[in-house]
């Protein structure tokens, strides 16, 4: 049995330009200790979309549901979507360290942007 699962329930999300997109992610535990970060794309060129403690992400808001008893919610909402936001978004768990070590990624959610 896996000690930690990172679950992105939607494989894809379609949003009209100008609207907001909600990207869902839950983790089964806070342990191992370490942050959850959101990225667009994979590999060394991936783009950091949201980090709770570092950086400035004016269009991104955490929208977790704290009433969820059986898991921890790390969902985000991205406002004012444009076609440039299209891509696959990954919720990634890190283990705290110096530096933090990537531990597990969700399966990814593909965001597509429809014309207004």
């Amino acid at each position: 049995e896996e000690e930690l699962q990172v679950i992105q329930p939607e494989k894809s999300v379609s949003v009209a330009a100008g609207e907001s997109a909600t990207l869902n992610c839950t983790a089964t535990s806070l342990i191992p200790v370490g942050p959850i970060q959101w990225f667009r794309g994979v590999g060394p060129g991936r783009e950091l979309i949201y980090h709770q403690k570092e950086g400035h992400f004016p269009r991104v808001t955490p929208v977790s549901d704290p009433t969820k008893r059986n898991n921890m919610d790390f969902s985000i909402r991205i406002s004012n979507i444009t076609p440039a936001d299209a891509g696959t978004y990954y919720c990634v768990k890190f283990r705290k360290g110096s530096p933090d070590v990537e531990l597990k990624s969700g399966a990814g959610t593909e965001l597509s942007v429809r014309a207004k």
């Epitope: 000690e3 806070l30 342990i31 200790v33 059986n70 921890m72």
Partner: antibody
Framework: EVQLVESGGGLVKPGGSLRLSCAAS????????MSWVRQTPGKGLEWVAT????????YYPDSVKGRFTLSRDNAKNSLYLQMNSLRAEDTAVYYC???????????WGQGTTVTVSS | DIVLTQSPASLAVSLGERATISCRAS??????????MHWYQQKPGQPPKLLIY???NLESGVPDRFSGSGSRTDFTLTINPLQAEDVATYYC?????????FGGGTKVEIK
């Protein structure tokens, strides 16, 4: 019904060792993060140790790091706290506690008393 | 370490009235919209019991006269109306960052 039953407490001299056990039942033990929390009249509640559901990751506060070792046997639904180099300030009631998400302590055992005295 | 300061240390409230307990954290315990602050009740000779998780969520089986509120550094546990069986010591606890810490407790008595 969830049950956590601690055992292994007792009187030990400073520098001595004790091994506490916690027997779990009534829930899927292997899915839960497990911890020990102790309570003293002077210092109140103090977190002592935590282990991940599969046993890979363990965490301790500085006050016990290097002296206490937490382990688990999921096949036996059991949690163990090996306490070495015990000090007078380790005297407390030790509670076993479960954490489904590694956050809040969902369930607590009744506690076992550890007294460190010469 | 995140220090949790509970106030008052003791509280005497008449039956049927409101009891309010405060817990202040030395730094924010919020992350991703969650407040990692929890409340426990402990009666003499018993272990602590979870009442409220993540600031405001009532644990299953806990009477709804208990409620929690707050975010970032300031949190409140409210018991309204206070009943005789609520006489106990109440503790706040943060799980936002290691080492996890507890408040010093608030003893609630009947006036």
């Amino acid at each position: 019904e969830v049950q956590l039953v601690e055992s292994g407490g007792g009187l030990v001299k400073p520098g001595g060792s004790l091994r506490l056990s916690c027997a779990a039942s009534g829930f899927t033990f292997s899915s839960y993060v497990m911890s020990w929390v102790r309570q003293t009249p002077g210092k109140g509640l103090e977190w002592v140790a935590t282990i991940s559901s599969g046993g890979t990751y363990t965490y301790y506060p500085d006050s016990v790091k290097g002296r206490f070792t937490l382990s688990r046997d999921n096949a036996k639904n059991s949690l163990y706290l090996q306490m070495n180099s015990l000090r007078a300030e380790d005297t407390a009631v030790y509670y076993c506690a479960s954490q489904l998400t590694g956050s809040e302590f969902d369930y607590w055992g009744q506690g076992t008393t550890v007294t460190v005295s010469s | 370490d995140i220090v949790l300061t509970q106030s008052p240390a003791s509280l005497a409230v008449s039956l049927g009235e409101r009891a309010t307990i405060s817990c202040r954290a030395s730094e924010s315990v919020d992350s991703y919209g969650n407040s990692f602050m929890h409340w426990y009740q402990q009666k003499p000779g018993q272990p602590p019991k979870l009442l409220i998780y993540r600031a405001s969520n009532l644990e299953s089986g806990v009477p709804d006269r208990f409620s929690g509120s707050g975010s970032r550094t300031d949190f409140t546990l409210t018991i309204n109306p206070l009943q005789a069986e609520d006489v106990a010591t109440y503790y706040c606890h943060q799980s936002a960052d290691l080492p996890w810490t507890f408040g010093g407790g608030t003893k609630v008595e009947i006036k």
